[in-house]
């Protein structure tokens, strides 16, 4: 698995470099973390026929993915930092339980999979730091994830398959997005 | 061509307990999930257990009806799946089915059965 | 765990009648439901996958459909040999559900 952001050599070897802003390191964050997403996808690819299902096949599912709104305040159509970075770190929050699922849902990219959910939970804690209203952030009850947890992972194989696609690319938008909007604050 | 076998029917007492086997051939048997289904005499199909493959942890699943009395394993190298049941009584007398599942979760292959007894 | 109801629990149909056996999902279960023919002292055998696709070498005059939870098997032209019990299985998620099957009779 590839080197987490800020722990690699050359942030060692470079030590007149100037520390990077709270800003740049959630927006180098984010991008390993795409990265990391992006290889787990080539694995799912190549896996199965998932990537080139239909959008209608794949639109049909129980999944109750994080998503960004109109009302969130991201777009730059009625923009809103505040209520935006709460979106932000309220989706991390809910995509947890996901990323756990995903854990043992590769063969070759297992470090990989495991990459992704540590990063996540790094860049949490970094947006977190960020937030002035942290009151607003709702935690997902660990009961129900727990519940949630043990569904995904009773579905059949192709339904596994359907839902580790649907993470995945669902992860991927939502860090998208949510990499647009944190440049614009 | 796809083969299952069960084996380890019988008459059995009841309070005791058996051990059915289930051997296949003619797939890559490490790729599926396998389930055991019965049917008492005269009545309908009852879903038993589910052993999942490597891939998925070697997952156990079971019908609540026998939760606590049954038992799924498999042996990878010998292309077989068993089910223990113990704690047997008169109602567990079935036709006990060994079956493939596929990746869609439909049970594409059955063997032909084993009959289990349980009487005095 | 998920309920499968199936009704009717029997009915006997003329050649000429359209026949149809439904089953009821207690919840959500996508297109994950397989139909399943037994006859007397044989193995179930799969007609059709994924509620509405035949199972090879299965004729045409069977078909299935789905109506958010709820589930059809329809025979169009029933023959003497259709005569057998018809079960649906839940396939979703385990642990798995057959339904209580049906009893057709084709006079």
């Known amino acids: 698995a590839p080197v987490p952001p800020g722990e690699d050599s050359k942030d060692v070897a470079a030590p007149h470099r100037q520390p990077l802003t709270s800003s740049e390191r959630i927006d180098k964050q984010i991008r390993y973390i795409l990265d990391g997403i992006s290889a787990l996808r080539k694995e799912t690819c190549n896996k199965s026929n998932m990537c080139e299902s239909s959008k209608e096949a794949l639109a049909e599912n129980n999944l109750n993915l994080p998503k960004m709104a109109e009302k969130d305040g991201c777009f730059q159509s009625g923009f809103n930092e505040e209520t935006c970075l709460v979106k932000i770190i309220t989706g991390l929050l809910e995509f947890e339980v996901y990323l756990e699922y995903l854990q043992n849902r590769f063969e070759s990219s297992e470090e990989q999979a495991r990459a992704v959910q540590m990063s996540t939970k790094v860049l949490i804690q970094f947006l977190q730091k960020k937030a002035k209203n942290l009151d607003a952030i709702t935690t997902p009850d660990p009961t129900t994830n727990a519940s949630l947890l043990t569904k995904l992972q009773a579905q059949n194989q192709w339904l596994q398959d359907m839902t580790t696609h649907l993470i995945l690319r669902s992860f991927k938008e939502f860090l998208q997005s949510s990499l647009r909007a944190l440049r614009q604050m | 061509e796809v083969q299952i076998l069960e084996t380890g029917g019988g008459l059995v007492k009841p309070g005791g307990s058996l051990r059915l086997s289930c051997a296949t051939s003619g797939f890559n048997f490490n790729d599926y999930f396998m389930n055991w289904v019965r049917q008492a005499p005269g009545k309908g199909l009852e879903w038993l257990a589910q052993?999942?493959?490597?891939?998925?942890?070697?997952?156990?699943y079971y019908a609540e009806s026998l939760e606590g009395r049954v038992t799924v394993s498999r042996d990878d190298a010998k292309n077989s799946v068993y089910l223990q049941v113990s704690s047997l009584r008169a109602e567990d007398t079935a036709i006990y089915y060994c079956t493939r599942e596929s990746y869609y979760g439909f049970t594409s292959y059955w063997g032909q059965g084993v009959m289990v007894t349980v009487s005095s | 765990d998920i309920q499968m109801t199936q009704s009717p629990a029997s009915l006997s149909a003329s050649l000429e009648e359209i026949v149809t056996i439904t089953c009821q999902a207690s919840?959500?279960?996508?297109?994950?439901l397989s139909w399943y023919q037994q006859k007397p002292g044989r193995t179930p055998q799969l007609l059709i996958q994924?509620?509405?696709n035949l199972a090879d070498g299965v004729p045409s005059r069977f078909s299935g459909r789905r109506f958010g939870t709820q589930f059809s098997l329809t025979i169009s032209t029933p023959q003497v040999e259709d005569t057998g019990v018809y079960y649906c299985l839940q396939h979703n998620s385990a642990p798995y559900t057959f339904g209580t099957g049906t009893q057709l009779e084709i006079k």
């Open positions: 994924n509620a509405n």
């Open positions: 919840q959500d279960i996508g297109i994950s």
């Open positions: 052993m999942r493959n490597k891939n998925y942890q070697y997952g156990t």
